[in-house]
């Protein structure tokens, strides 16, 4: 088989994970995962609640082959993409009259990666080169995180990427396809 069909080639290989330790384990609240709370409507006192289960974010999936130069993983890997609005929120009209989720006051929450997992992948190379083993770091779960005054707003504006989670001495990981590219593909479908 040739390699010409592999277009998912923007995956970063992370040879050693030691320099990017996983966040300390936290108790998982399953109620926050994949739930549409309150039927999409805000509770009576949307910003007074301290119950984190009221804030949910959507976990989508992203599957790709891992590549390193001409080499490609034997199997694709699947990770989570953290997306969506962390409710509860108020539905207010925008300037041109279409509905828009907007929280004009109260705490600001973002859906960001919570936990990561290391997965070992075998890379197959053309030309009879020996297979290589690598570890990749994949998003394993998402959570709604409250923005504090210590957060830079620009760091969290891109909800679906690891850029939302500042990490010392690390460049943001490129996605196989940018959110904008994905959106263009989605728009073509309608």
């Amino acid at each position: 088989q040739g390699w010409q069909a592999f277009k998912n080639d923007a995956t970063e290989i992370i040879p050693e994970l030691g320099e990017y330790p996983e966040p300390p384990p936290e108790l998982e609240n399953n109620k926050t995962m994949n739930r549409a709370e309150n039927g999409g409507r805000p509770p009576h006192h949307p910003f007074e609640t301290k119950d984190v289960s009221e804030y949910s974010c959507r976990e989508l999936h992203f599957t790709r082959y891992v590549t390193d130069g001409p080499c490609r993983s034997a199997k694709p890997v699947t990770e989570l993409v953290c997306s969506g609005q962390c409710g509860p929120a108020r539905l207010l009209p925008n300037a041109i009259g279409r509905g828009k989720w907007w929280r004009p006051s109260g705490p600001d929450f973002r859906c960001i990666p919570d936990r990561y997992r290391a997965q070992r992948v075998q890379l197959l190379c053309p030309g009879g080169e020996a297979p290589r083993a690598r570890k990749v770091r994949l998003v394993a779960s998402c959570k709604c995180k409250r923005l504090t005054r210590f957060h830079n707003q620009s760091e969290l504006k891109d909800f679906g990427t690891e850029a939302a989670r500042p990490q010392k001495g690390r460049k943001p990981r490129p996605r196989a396809r940018s959110a904008k590219a994905n959106q263009a593909e989605l728009e073509n479908a309608y």
Partner: nanobody
């Protein structure tokens, strides 16, 4: 929004055949590689096969020569033809696109009896 609807599963005797379909919408199907995965009870979801946008295919060793993945870009559908089925092929089968965000479909149950 990406939507994936798998169908064609069922109960079949060992050595029999099934053809699974995955109807997609919400993205430009012809531009994306498509994969089939499966998940047996109590096990992790595992990769089975990929068909790339250019038509090349890729399979795990355990299904090579028995399963064939194909696509119909006009119908936005990917197929998995499964022949010489074995009891260990019993699982829920899922399809997914590569390189775009999606939510897993409901899958289609395949049960192979001995």
């Amino acid at each position: 929004e990406v939507q994936l609807v798998e169908s064609g599963g069922g109960l079949v005797q060992a050595g029999g055949s099934l053809r699974l379909s995955c109807a997609t919408s919400g993205f430009t199907f012809s531009r994306f590689d498509m994969s089939w995965f499966r998940q047996a009870p109590g096990k992790q979801r595992e990769f089975i096969a990929t068909i790339f946008s250019g038509g090349d295919t890729d399979y795990i060793d355990s299904v090579k020569g028995r399963f064939t993945i194909s696509r119909d870009n006009a119908k936005n559908t990917v197929y998995l033809q499964m022949n010489s089925l074995k009891p260990e092929d019993t699982a829920v089968y899922y399809c997914c696109p590569l390189g775009i965000e999606y939510a897993w479909g409901q899958g289609t149950q395949v049960t192979v009896s001995s």
